[in-house]
């Protein structure tokens, strides 16, 4: 049983990486002297209380930065936010903290991250690039929901 977060790096199919800019995650083409974020992820320890066959429920944070990804409604729209939160505090909670949880599914080298709080909504980046990460229901050409996750050991 793993009870420390794993670290990983993420890029999309267009080789864009996640960068932290003004407390917002954006996807940009990888360049020299750029510092992509390192992701911290840990599986929910209450996996038996969540939906089966939807993916591995994980908490997603930014390694070393005490920031975690969460989903919350703004008006009627689920949005992706970064919150100041220790990922291990989420992990240790007596119940799944759904707003911070994502179903991680892998198909070959591609990973998707679906909100547990808002089923059917996925972490995405606009195909244009240089844009903030968002949540989307539309798995079409306008947004990329497939990411490459490389674990760092």
């Amino acid at each position: 049983k793993i009870d420390t977060p794993q670290r990983g790096s993420i890029q999309d199919i267009n080789h864009r990486v996640w960068v932290l800019q003004d407390q917002t995650l954006i996807a940009v083409p990888r360049k020299d002297r750029m510092s992509p974020v390192t992701i911290a992820l840990i599986s929910c320890r209450h996996v038996e209380t969540l939906e089966k066959d939807r993916g591995n429920p994980i908490y997603l944070g930014l390694n070393g930065l005490n920031l975690c990804l969460m989903c919350a409604k703004v008006g009627d729209q689920p949005t992706l936010q970064l919150k100041e939160k220790d990922i291990m505090d989420l992990y240790n909670q007596p119940e799944p903290v759904k707003s911070f949880l994502f179903y991680h599914s892998q198909s070959g080298r591609n990973s998707t991250f679906e909100s547990v709080a808002f089923p059917g909504w996925f972490i995405a980046v606009s195909s244009e690039g240089g844009c903030p990460l968002i949540l989307t229901q539309e798995l079409g050409k306008a947004n990329t929901t497939d990411f490459g996750l490389t674990m760092l050991f």
């Epitope: 038996e48 209380t49 969540l50 505090d89 909670q93 007596p94 119940e95 903290v97 759904k98």
Partner: antibody
Framework: QVQLVQSGAEVKKPGASVKVSCKAS????????IYWVRQAPGQGLEWIGR????????RYDPKFQGKATLTTDTSTSTAYLELSSLRSEDTAVYYC??????????????WGQGTLVTVSS | QAVVTQEPSLTVSPGGTVTLTCRSS?????????ANWVQEKPGQLFTGLIG???DRAPGVPARFSGSLLGGKAALTLSGAQPEDEADYFC?????????FGGGTKLTVL
Amino acid sequence: QVQLVQSGAEVKKPGASVKVSCKASGFNIKDTYIYWVRQAPGQGLEWIGRIDPAIGTTRYDPKFQGKATLTTDTSTSTAYLELSSLRSEDTAVYYCARYDYSGSSFYFDYWGQGTLVTVSS
Amino acid sequence: QAVVTQEPSLTVSPGGTVTLTCRSSTGAVTTSNYANWVQEKPGQLFTGLIGGTNDRAPGVPARFSGSLLGGKAALTLSGAQPEDEADYFCALWYSNHLVFGGGTKLTVL
């Protein structure tokens, strides 16, 4: 405003079953966990179990496994507790409560008014 | 299964300070037990006071605080008011299940 309104008092014979309801209003029942707790006369509180209304998954105190069944009907925002094979020791006030995450921790923030179940021959 | 024990009754003077405790039969209470405290006033609904050992629920007066004290979970009431007269219950998490204490009847006299 947030409210949990429970069904009325019940009198049952030993061996019978009872189903207590808890109707939620002022919030989306699928956004939280509903807990069930009981208080026998002159006793403390006893946790029965909880349900995640969004997906229907449950947890029970080992003592109530097989005795209690938790369900929800999200279309009517109602949670249910069904107790089977009732005995006199099941005479108690049964409460539903919302167990919600608010920024840093889970809290029991709202409770139903309680439903008295009396088991008597 | 674990047994959670509270003082059956305590008395505090108005404006005074009192500490209610919650002991576990399995040993010292830790932050991993995520202590919760709830209040029941006569004729009123239960209300949550504390979650996660020391996090006050939204809207709860600052005179209520949660902590760990000598291997027990503690609820401290500083500057007791007459309206704080009530029954107080703690609950501790043990892995995947929750155990309540027997409750403390607090009198403000």
